[in-house]
C-alpha cells in the first residue's frame, strides 16, 4: 500500500559555515527499505559517493561543506516490492561565508519593553537582493526569515520583530545573498541581543 513520506533533517543544522561538517538524515519506513536523497533542479554528485552502508541507514554525511553542496533537498525510501514513498518535505541546505558580513542593528534601540515590537535593520556594504534574519537560541537551530531589500536598488532589509517577552533570550544574526544563488549566504553579522524590559 501507500508508503508515508519520510522526515529529512540536517545535523547539527541546515545553515552551515563553509568548511564545517553536516549530515543529512532521512528517516522513514521499515528497516528493509532503501533510502534516496536528491537535490531539486540540479543533480548533487556528492550523494553518489556516499558508502552504501550509510545510505541504507538514511545517513548522508558531508565532512566539509562547500558551495557545491548548497541547495534544496528531498528524500524518499522504498523497495522493488513495496514501491516508492512520498518525497519528504524540502530541506534547504545553506552554506554561509560567501561574502563579507552585513551589519545588524535595532531601531530605534535594542532595548524593548515587554510586549513591544522592534525594527531590525540589516545593512550590506555591497548591493544584494536577498537578506535573511535568523533567530538563534541556546539549544535550538536558527529559525530564519528571508526578505528582499526594502527599496529597489537598496542594500538594506527591514524586519519587524515582536511582540517580545522577557521569558527567553532574543538573539539575532542576519545574512545577505544573491537571489541567483539563494543557498549561498554571506558571513553572519555580529550577534544582536535584544534587551527586554519588564
Amino acid at each position: 500500500g501507500h508508503l508515508p513520506k519520510p522526515t529529512l533533517w540536517a545535523e547539527p543544522g541546515s545553515v552551515i559555515t563553509q568548511g564545517s561538517p553536516v549530515t543529512l538524515r532521512c528517516q522513514g519506513g521499515q528497516e528493509t527499505q532503501e533510502y534516496r536523497l536528491y537535490r531539486e533542479k540540479k543533480t548533487a554528485l556528492w550523494i553518489t559517493r556516499i558508502p552504501q552502508e550509510l545510505v541504507k541507514k538514511g545517513q548522508f554525511p558531508i565532512p566539509s561543506i562547500t558551495w557545491e553542496h548548497a541547495g534544496r533537498y528531498r528524500c524518499y525510501y522504498g523497495s522493488d516490492t513495496a514501491g516508492r514513498s512520498e518525497s519528504s518535505d524540502p530541506l534547504e541546505l545553506v552554506v554561509t561565508g560567501a561574502y563579507i558580513k552585513p551589519t545588524l542593528s535595532a531601531q530605534p534601540s535594542p532595548v524593548v519593553n515587554s510586549g513591544g515590537n522592534v525594527i531590525l535593520q540589516c545593512d550590506s556594504q555591497v548591493a544584494f537582493d536577498g537578506f535573511s534574519l535568523c533567530k538563534e537560541g541556546e539549544d535550538e537551530h536558527p529559525q530564519c526569515l528571508n526578505s528582499q531589500p526594502h527599496a529597489r536598488g537598496s542594500s538594506r532589509a527591514i524586519f519587524s520583530v515582536g511582540p517580545v517577552s522577557p521569558s527567553r533570550r532574543w538573539w539575532y544574526r542576519c545574512y545577505a545573498y544573491d537571489s541567483n544563488s539563494p543557498y549561498e549566504w554571506s558571513l553572519p553579522s555580529d550577534l544582536l541581543e535584544l534587551l527586554v524590559l519588564g
Partner: antibody, heavy 126, light 110 residues
Framework: QSLEESEGGLVKPGGTLTLTCTAS?????????MCWVRQAPGKGLELIAC????????TYYASWAKGRFTISKSSSTTITLQMTSLTAADTATYFC???????????????????WGPGTLVTVSS | ELDLTQTPSSVEAAVGGTVTIKCQAS??????LAWYQQKPGQPPNLLIY???TLASGVSSRFKGSGSGTEFTLTISDLECADAATYYC????????????FGGGTEVEIK
Amino acid sequence: QSLEESEGGLVKPGGTLTLTCTASGFSFSSSYCMCWVRQAPGKGLELIACIYTDSSGATYYASWAKGRFTISKSSSTTITLQMTSLTAADTATYFCARGWDYEDPGYTDTTYFSLWGPGTLVTVSS
Amino acid sequence: ELDLTQTPSSVEAAVGGTVTIKCQASQTIYTNLAWYQQKPGQPPNLLIYAASTLASGVSSRFKGSGSGTEFTLTISDLECADAATYYCQSYYGSSTTGNGFGGGTEVEIK
C-alpha cells in the same frame, strides 16, 4: 509479483490497438514508474512511455511516441497503451516494465526496471 | 536528445575469460545508468543500477563502473550462461534530453 501483457496479434496498417499490462501480487496503490518498452525483431530496446502511479499521475513519452501512443492507468492493477496509425515499423515485441526508484516526475523522468512482463508480439501487416 | 553508444556491438570470449562493454552518453548522466542482460525470447534482466550497484540476486562477476559520460560493464570468469545481449540504459534527464537504451552488445562464449 509479476506483470503480464495482453495478447498482441496482427493489425492492419493505419489500425489501432490497445495493449494491457496486468499486475499480479501487487497493486498500483503503491507508487511505481510503469513503462512500456518495445523491441523490433532482431533489434534493440526502445522506451515508449511511462506513467507514475503516485498521486501526480504524471506521464512521460519518448519524443517519437508523442501523439500516436497514449499510456494510462485503467485500474489499480492495469496499465494500458493505446497505439494509433500503426505502420510496419511498429512491428515489435511490447514489454511492460516496473521501477520504483525515481526522483520527481518531470525532472528525472524514468528509472531502471527490475520487473518485466514476458512481452507480447504486435505485427502490423496487410 | 541523449544518445547512448554501446561498443562493441558483438564480442566473442572464452569460458573463464573477461569481457568489457562500454557505454558512452552524449551528455552527462551522472551515475543514472543501468545494465541489463537479455536472452532470446526473454525480457531483459536487471544487472546493475546507479552505474555500479549490483541488483539483487546478481552474481558479483558482473561489475559496473563509470560516471558522467563513460561507463563500463565488466563480466569476469565467463560462463556459458553469460551468452546474451547486454544493454545499457540512461534514466537521467527531462523529456527534452530523452531517456533510453544503448544499441546492445551481443556476447558469444567459445
